[in-house]
């Protein structure tokens, strides 16, 4: 902590410039008012000071804010932000998405920082929810933002939101979040016609059921194998052979190179050989003609 | 063809919990998404949230802090637990199932089960 | 939440004529809704989803019309089965809601 002395003659400043960088540390703690550094928050950023002299002007507003800074402050921080710690971060009460974005800017191409994290989680639990505008400004500045949130979080995103979510900010959800995000995307591209649909839900199959997915290769869209690949196996398993045609269209030959993988893998050896060799693709593994299924699961769920 | 079965008590205490199970017979649990609705007696219908089979779940706001929806895959069932219950939560549960493959969206319900009454009473 | 008001809340009609159910949402749902036939001692039961599609087994005397806030339930010619309750609901956002229902009852 820096040590109180009195500000020398004729150093009390009376507005932030660019005459402070040539301030010790100790005149800056005793010249500088906190008062004033808040009120003119937003020249600290185009002042070039030096680590140490932020630590001391960050003090100052500490002294001055025991109980967190106020947003009129926090919106001007720039370059002192970095300076927080989540400690910090967690008294404030941000609510303006203009200071959300001030602030993401300055640590903008860097990781998601802890303060950032910190910061995101404040606000957004002080709006209740996760909204389309601040979703928007998350995945601007940290595109697997929606990725790193638990499913838990992720259920107080609401339908509205999603128009805001793009293929890319899906790219590392798993099957869990996939799960929370799918129904709430099926709820908010229900209004759009069929091929428009397709565009917009394709990002999302990940966490479809089986009867959606049913539906879907009613609708001549025309899956990639891409998409296919992302499918939960256990919605894949029951469809038939017919279905999977459908679904992928013309990209059904692209399972033959896939046949060694999950989910298409799985899926052939639930197949009837005769069933896939309509296909033409030579895919292999099949049940060999004659043999009985029995769905072990499903007898199971009835006794 | 599927068919689905409410089972619980039919009396709770107020501020006991809730707890009622919904069997899924003749399909499979894992095609789509499954609800709990209620009715109060001479009243309409509420609709209290679903489930999907890995467990993800999404509930009506004016419930949500008293609800817990939960599903077992083993067995074909998912589950409604409702704590802290009053005289006002007395009423005819429903478990539903919402639509599959008459659309590709859509949250309504084309099969229901016949309903069982709980009475929150001392 | 979406407030769905059905009207009237009872109606009487005599068997063979149409009658007509009104169902308008606080906001608008687009075609997000459906409607459903209860009868005491049941469940309900799927009539009209997307505002006019009749659901599987559904009789052609029953119709929906209508989009965004202002929907209509048309059974054209009442049979004696048909006299029940009967419930709107939007599936245009969370929280689903429905109407507090109509009771067709016979004149």
């Known amino acids: 902590e820096v040590e109180k002395t009195a500000c020398p003659s004729g150093k009390k400043a009376r507005e932030i410039d660019e005459s402070l960088i040539f301030y010790k540390k100790w005149e800056l703690e005793a010249c500088v008012d906190a008062a004033l550094l808040a009120t003119q928050m937003d020249r600290v950023n185009a002042i070039p000071f030096t680590y140490e002299q932020l630590d001391v002007l960050k003090h100052k507003l500490d002294e001055l804010y025991p109980q967190g800074y106020p947003e009129s402050v926090i919106q001007h921080l720039g370059y002192l932000f970095l300076k927080m710690s989540p400690e910090d971060i967690r008294k404030w009460n941000v609510t303006s998405l203009e200071t959300l974005k001030a602030l993401l800017e300055v640590n903008k191409g860097h990781e998601m920082s802890p303060q950032v994290a910190t910061l995101i989680d404040r606000f957004v639990k002080g709006r209740g929810q996760l909204d389309k505008d601040t979703l928007d400004t998350l995945t601007a500045f940290y595109p697997g933002y929606l990725c790193s949130l638990s499913p838990e979080e992720l259920s107080s995103v609401p339908p509205s939101s999603i128009w805001a979510v793009r293929p890319q900010d899906l790219d590392t959800c798993d099957p869990r979040q996939l799960d929370v995000l799918y129904p709430k995307a099926r709820l908010a591209f229900q209004n759009m016609n069929g091929s428009e649909y397709f565009v917009k839900i394709q990002s999302f199959l990940g966490g479809a059921p089986t009867e959606d997915l049913k539906a879907l290769s009613q609708q001549n869209v025309s899956m990639d194998l891409a998409t296919f690949m992302k499918l939960r196996t256990d919605a894949v398993l029951p469809l038939t052979v017919a279905e999977v045609q459908k679904l992928l269209g013309p990209h059904v030959e692209g399972l033959k190179a896939e046949e060694r993988h999950r989910p298409v893998r799985d899926w052939i050896l639930r197949q009837r050989q005769d069933d896939l060799d309509t296909l033409g693709l030579g895919l292999q593994g099949g049940i060999p003609n004659g043999y009985l299924v029995l769905d072990l699961s499903m007898q199971e769920a009835l006794s | 063809q599927v068919q689905l079965q409410e089972s619980g008590p039919g009396l709770v205490k107020p501020s006991e919990t809730l707890s009622l199970t919904c069997t899924v017979s003749?399909?499979?649990?894992?095609?789509?998404?499954w609800s709990w609705v209620r009715q109060p007696p001479g009243k309409g219908l509420e609709w209290i949230g679903y489930i999907f089979y890995s467990g993800s779940t999404q509930s009506n706001p004016s419930l949500k802090s008293r609800v817990i929806i939960s599903v077992d895959t083993s067995k074909n069932q998912f589950s409604l637990k409702l704590s802290s219950v009053t005289a006002a939560d007395t009423a005819v549960y429903y478990c539903?199932?919402?639509?599959?493959?008459?659309?590709?969206?859509?949250?309504?319900?084309?099969?229901w089960g016949r309903g069982t009454l709980v009475t929150v009473s001392s | 939440e979406i407030v769905m008001t059905q009207s009237p809340a009872t109606l009487s009609v005599s068997p063979g004529e149409r009658a007509t159910l009104s169902c308008r949402a606080s906001q608008s749902v687009n075609s997000n809704l459906a409607w459903y036939q209860q009868k005491p001692g049941q469940a309900p039961r799927l009539l009209i989803y997307g505002a006019s599609t009749r659901a599987t087994g559904i009789p052609a005397r029953f119709s929906g019309s209508g989009s965004g806030t202002e929907f209509t339930l048309t059974i054209s010619s009442l049979q004696s089965e048909d006299f029940a309750v009967y419930y709107c609901q939007q599936y245009n956002n969370w929280p689903l809601t429905f109407g507090q229902g109509t009771r067709l009852e016979i004149k």
């Open positions: 539903a199932r919402e639509v599959g493959r008459i659309a590709v969206a859509g949250w309504f319900f084309d099969l």
């Open positions: 003749g399909g499979s649990i894992q095609n789509y998404y």
